[in-house]
């Protein structure tokens, strides 16, 4: 009987010899549950598992807790991989998180965190980040220490308001904080002075809604 080869992340896919960008099926160890993820096999040495992408506003990111838990969208386009998968993956070994950003003027920037993991669902998928470098700001636009994840039906933020309803999208809101990469997608020339756009404050400042974002992870020892 032929043994089924499975990969937990895109780094394993890359090391197995598949070095082409594209959608691959991933499976966690000791699990039968599969997820489809986009693998970036070119950027910075390859092996990156894309956990979020915004590029054209084609997918609605104002989703429920369950949808953010299991993932939604199209891995070839705009999507969210899923908090549960990312939580389990990042608690099995050490991962880095790279956030790549594009503005409407043709500029690109990134933030790289040398250690990233999400807590379990019981702890509201709280984000943990350490060691920021990159060109998208010297201060982390994801509030530190990390916050719990909030969605339109799960208010875990530190605001008297409900950040996910006010800003739209699920995110690790503070009150509400300097970022929200899952906010409303605004087209060019309609992307400034926005209270609920795709925000990364320490790169583009207040009210600027970005053209594109990609969140990707890779084992630290890759």
């Amino acid at each position: 009987k032929e043994e089924q080869i499975s990969f937990r992340d895109c780094a394993e896919v890359f090391k197995s010899g598949h070095t082409t960008n594209g959608v691959y099926t991933l499976t966690l160890p000791n699990s039968t549950e599969e997820v489809k993820a986009y693998c970036d096999m070119e950027a910075g040495g390859g092996g990156w598992t894309i956990i979020q992408r915004r590029e054209d506003g084609s997918v609605d990111f104002q989703r429920t807790w369950k949808e953010y838990k299991v993932g939604f969208g199209n891995p070839s386009g705009e999507y969210w991989l899923g908090n549960e998968f990312v939580s389990q993956l990042t608690n099995q070994q050490r991962y880095v998180l790279k956030i790549h950003l594009k503005d409407w003027e043709g500029n690109e920037a990134y933030s790289l965190y040398e250690h990233f993991y999400l807590s379990s669902e019981e702890l509201n998928y709280r984000i943990h980040l350490k060691g920021l470098t990159g060109t998208a700001g010297k201060i982390s636009s994801i509030s530190q220490p990390g916050n719990d994840f909030s969605t339109k039906d799960a208010d875990n933020d530190k605001c008297i308001c409900k950040c996910s309803q006010m800003l739209t999208g699920g995110w690790w809101f503070d009150a509400c904080g300097p970022s929200n990469l899952n906010g409303m997608y605004y087209p060019q020339r309609q992307n400034t002075n926005k209270f609920n756009g795709i925000k990364w404050y320490y790169w583009k400042g207040s009210g600027y809604s970005l053209k594109g974002t990609t969140m990707m992870i890779r084992p630290a020892d890759f």
Epitope: C159, I160, C161, M166, N193, F195, K199, Y201, S206, G207
Partner: nanobody, 129 residues
Framework: EVQLVESGGGLVQAGGSLRLSCAAS????????IGWFRQAPGKEREGVSA????????YYADSVKGRFTISSDNDKNTVYLQMNSLKPEDTAVYYC??????????????????????WGQGTLVTVSS
């Protein structure tokens, strides 16, 4: 479309007065807080004063307390900053900005700079000695 337009800046002698206006459109002052900020050449943008119509709260930086007064006119959807006893160190570009009033951290009264998502273009205030 949210828009903020400042006016009223100019050149004034030390000890003089100016009144800045911030005309808001695309939203009503009832639901938002409006802040005045300033930025001098080579310096960080700093908060000067703010007003929240929903509960009547006002805020002043220590450096302007007793000299500046913030007020609003809901009918005109405009916020004013009356600046008296001006000093050369008040020289800066003055901006007004808006934040949804409810975007407050538990236990806090005011908002960090990054919560103000709508900004005007600014008006220059020059105080000569």
């Amino acid at each position: 479309e949210v828009q903020l337009v400042e006016s009223g800046g100019g050149l004034v002698q030390a000890g003089g007065s100016l009144r800045l206006s911030c005309a808001a459109s695309g939203f009503t002052l009832d639901d938002y807080a409006i802040g005045w900020f300033r930025q001098a050449p080579g310096k960080e943008r700093e908060g000067v004063s703010a007003i929240r119509d929903s509960d009547g709260s006002t805020y002043y930086a220590d450096s302007v307390k007793g000299r500046f007064t913030i007020s609003s006119d809901n009918d005109k959807n405009t916020v004013y900053l009356q600046m008296n006893s001006l000093k050369p160190e008040d020289t800066a570009v003055y901006y007004c900005a808006a934040v949804p009033a409810g975007r407050l951290r538990f236990g806090e009264q005011w908002y960090p700079l990054y919560e103000y998502d709508a900004w005007g273009q600014g008006t220059l205030v020059t105080v000569s000695s």
